[in-house]
């Protein structure tokens, strides 16, 4: 296993609709054809997997149908979008990139993007 540098923004504010997008960029030492991207969430010292996708270079990322993540790739960049976020989902989202094929296997883990999520203010009751 060889190490690889992964860069991501330090902090992002999700939209009022609970959507957060950020780029995860990796310094590929070689010409990988198969890449796996995993998003991990760290909160209160617990790390959980949010979503993961394996893709062939030049193809779209395919997450599971029920995944809250979508993404696109361009060269050594992956543009990740996480949706359905609520205030309680605020936390550190870490991008993990694995170059699966061809060998050698490379692993890179970013420092994480702190995503802040603000629940929208409830609309005041109105009489019609």
């Amino acid at each position: 296993c060889k190490a690889m540098h992964v860069a991501q923004p330090a902090v992002v504010l999700a939209s009022s609709r609970g959507i957060a997008s950020f780029v995860c960029e990796y310094a590929s030492p070689g010409k990988a054809t198969e890449v796996r991207v995993t998003v991990l969430r760290q909160a209160d010292s617990q790390v959980t997997e949010v979503c993961a996708a394996t893709y062939m270079m030049g193809n779209e990322l395919t997450f599971l149908d029920d995944s809250i993540c979508t993404g696109t790739s361009s060269g050594n960049q992956v543009n990740l979008t996480i949706q359905g976020l609520r205030a309680m989902d605020t936390g550190l989202y870490i991008c993990k990139v694995e170059l699966m094929y061809p060998p050698p296997y490379y692993l890179g883990i970013g420092n994480g993007t702190q995503i802040y999520v603000i629940d929208p203010e409830p609309c005041p009751d109105s009489d019609f």
């Epitope: 923004p9 330090a10 902090v11 992002v12 504010l13 999700a14 939209s15 009022s16 997008s21 950020f22 909160a43 209160d44 205030a87 309680m88 605020t90 936390g91 702190q114 802040y116 603000i118």
Partner: antibody
């Protein structure tokens, strides 16, 4: 070194608007947020809101909603805070600060005086 | 909104003594997203502690933070002359990101 430099003092009449700038250097501007905090003479700190320089999304204090606008110009690594319909109780020192976990780097402050 | 109440309002101590400052929240602070700042007259605030207990870069180890939920504490183990200032707590877990009213630490 990491630095935030704010624009100079302003004197405004009630009802006018003010725009304070905050120029960042020494770090990747789009990787962080910029918070705005004000402090009236002899008073404590009041959080006004923040903007994610990465995507331009904003979160404002409800009491200022509709009067405040925070923006960024990523080409010059500068954040702006505009406050409209100024009142005498808006007289304060306005600070910008880099935000991630709390506010770790602060500007020097901009004094805004609202007086007729 | 979360109201942060700091106590005492003023604390009079001598250099070398231990200072304990309290910050109480009206409801639980999400993930202990609580910061402490120091402010001296005519200066911008300075971040001391974030995440309730993590020291910011360049902050001496005589400053420590603790607590979770609704009760948080800033401790200065041995006061230096330059520590006399106003201290603010702030929660940044739930919008709006409110500040406490401050504790003034003065020389006895």
């Amino acid at each position: 070194q990491v630095q935030l430099v704010q624009s100079g003092a302003e004197v405004k009449k009630p009802g006018a608007s003010v725009r304070v700038s905050c120029k960042a250097s020494g770090y990747t501007f789009t990787s962080y947020g910029i918070s705005w905090v004000r402090q009236a003479p002899g008073q404590g700190l009041e959080w006004m809101g923040w903007i994610s320089a990465y995507n331009g999304n904003t979160n404002y204090a409800q009491k200022l909603q509709g009067r405040v606008t925070m923006t960024t110009d990523t080409s010059t690594s500068t954040a702006y805070m505009e406050l409209r319909s100024l009142r005498s109780d808006d007289t304060a020192v306005y600070y910008c600060a880099r935000f991630i976990y709390g506010m770790d780097v602060w500007g020097q402050g901009t004094t805004v005086t609202v007086s007729s | 909104e979360i109201v942060l109440t700091q106590s005492p309002g003023t604390l009079s101590l001598s250099p070398g003594e231990r200072a304990t400052l309290s910050c109480r929240a009206s409801q639980s602070v999400f993930s202990s997203y609580l910061a402490w700042y120091q402010q001296k007259p005519g200066q911008a605030p300075r971040l001391l502690i974030y995440g309730a207990s993590s020291r910011a870069t360049g902050i001496p180890d005589r400053f420590s933070g603790s607590g979770s939920g609704t009760d948080f504490t800033l401790t200065i183990s041995r006061l230096e002359p330059e520590d006399f200032a106003v201290y603010y707590c702030q929660q940044y877990g739930t919008s709006p990101y409110t500040f406490g009213q401050g504790t003034k630490l003065e020389i006895k």
